[in-house]
């Protein structure tokens, strides 16, 4: 494998990780796929000091992270365990709503204006963060 | 200057396989997504297949799914689709396509697969 | 999937001419456009991308614009070397990247 030892252009080091921050909007699913095909994934929030770093960057704009609950209980797109990870909801959330008329409820998280986190419908075209772990061996396939 | 040349194009029987290459240079190829696009004879672009900069990450259009692989050798500089149960509708161009910011931003020349008995 | 229906199929076109190609997506994509000159037996070109960019290397006569589900590419002054077939892509949601169905440029 290859090890990455510095951020790509135009990415934001932090605390041996690299951040990519979006100006256009796109669906969750999007929005993982388009960090995927960078070797990254959705920013996934771990710490009070990650979540100030990213709150800066994005400033007051609703913005994907790489939480969801698509398929039952909540989880970060790396596997990090949410239910003893770090969590930064708004009072009353995540609340699943069904009132929005859209069909189903609410399973993506966002940032929300204040920072703090709301759960939503997926397809919303919101801003998005990708996150990609300096140091870490990138298993590249061995070729067929 | 960004440069794409692929190779490995040709003739090939209905249910056959074949394995596509494509040369790059004047880039940072480990660091860039690359894509496969076809064009059947004339007719129009149809995207393939795509791959993260490691090769890690993979995506494939419905029509090629579980028959093609995209591959790539960062050490090599070159992206690879190799092509199996090869079908009468396949016959194309093909096209390598480097991506930035998700969209193909430099094109090879292609190289012409044909898929005939 | 993201279906882009591009318009005209094909016109016809005299030296000098202004003309407008439009791309319609079946749903929002931002600016998430690109447009691609093509001539025959030769890879596509990328001419404009986010949309209203003009690649680098690009004459000033090609322009974007539109945002949303409708899109525009302009030639504002028909050279002889424009004539060829122009693609509309999204990349907005993938997979998969989404093609218009081409626009052939010819002389009238």
């Known amino acids: 494998g290859s090890e990455r030892t510095c951020c790509p252009v135009n990415w934001v080091e932090h605390e041996r990780s690299c951040y990519w921050f979006s100006r256009s909007g796109k669906a969750w699913a999007d929005a993982d796929n388009y960090c995927r095909l960078e070797d990254a994934h959705l920013v996934v929030v771990t710490s009070w000091e990650e979540q100030k770093f990213v709150q800066h960057h994005i400033g007051p704009v609703n913005t994907w992270m790489g939480l969801h609950d698509q398929n039952g209980p909540w989880k970060w797109v790396d596997g990090t365990d949410y239910e003893t990870g770090f969590k930064n909801w708004r009072p009353e959330q995540p609340d699943d709503w069904y009132g929005h008329g859209l069909g189903g409820g609410e399973d993506c998280a966002h940032f929300t204006d204040d920072g703090r986190w709301n759960d939503d419908v997926c397809q919303r075209p919101y801003r998005w963060v990708c996150e990609t772990e300096l140091d870490k061996a990138s298993q590249e396939p061995p070729l067929l | 200057e960004v440069q794409l040349l692929e190779s490995g194009g040709g003739l090939v029987q209905p249910g056959g396989s074949l394995r596509l290459s494509c040369a790059a240079s004047g880039f940072t190829f480990r660091s860039y997504a690359m894509s496969w696009v076809r064009q059947a004879p004339g007719k129009g672009l149809e995207w393939v297949s795509a791959?993260?900069?490691?090769?890690?990450?993979?995506f494939y259009a419905d029509s090629v799914k579980g028959r093609f692989t995209i591959s790539r050798d960062n050490s090599k500089n070159t992206l690879y689709l190799q092509m199996n149960s090869l079908r009468a509708e396949d016959t194309a161009v093909y096209y390598c396509?480097?991506?930035?910011?998700?969209?193909?931003?430099?094109w090879g020349q292609g190289t012409l697969v044909t898929v005939s008995s | 999937d993201i279906q882009m229906t591009q318009s005209p199929s094909s016109l016809s076109a005299s030296v000098g001419d202004r003309i407008t190609i439009t791309c319609r997506a079946s749903q929002g994509i931002g600016n998430d456009l690109g447009w691609y000159q093509q001539k025959p037996g030769k890879a596509p070109e990328r001419l404009i991308y986010?949309?209203?960019s003009l690649q680098s290397g690009v004459p000033s006569r090609f322009s974007g614009s539109g945002s949303g589900t409708e899109f525009t590419l302009t030639i504002s002054s028909l050279q002889p070397e424009d004539f060829a077939t122009y693609y509309c892509l999204q990349h907005n949601s993938f997979p998969p990247w989404t093609f218009g169905q081409g626009t052939k440029v010819e002389i009238k």
């Open positions: 791959t993260s900069g490691s090769g890690v990450n993979t």
């Open positions: 396509a480097k991506l930035e910011l998700g969209i193909f931003d430099y």
């Open positions: 986010a949309a209203s």
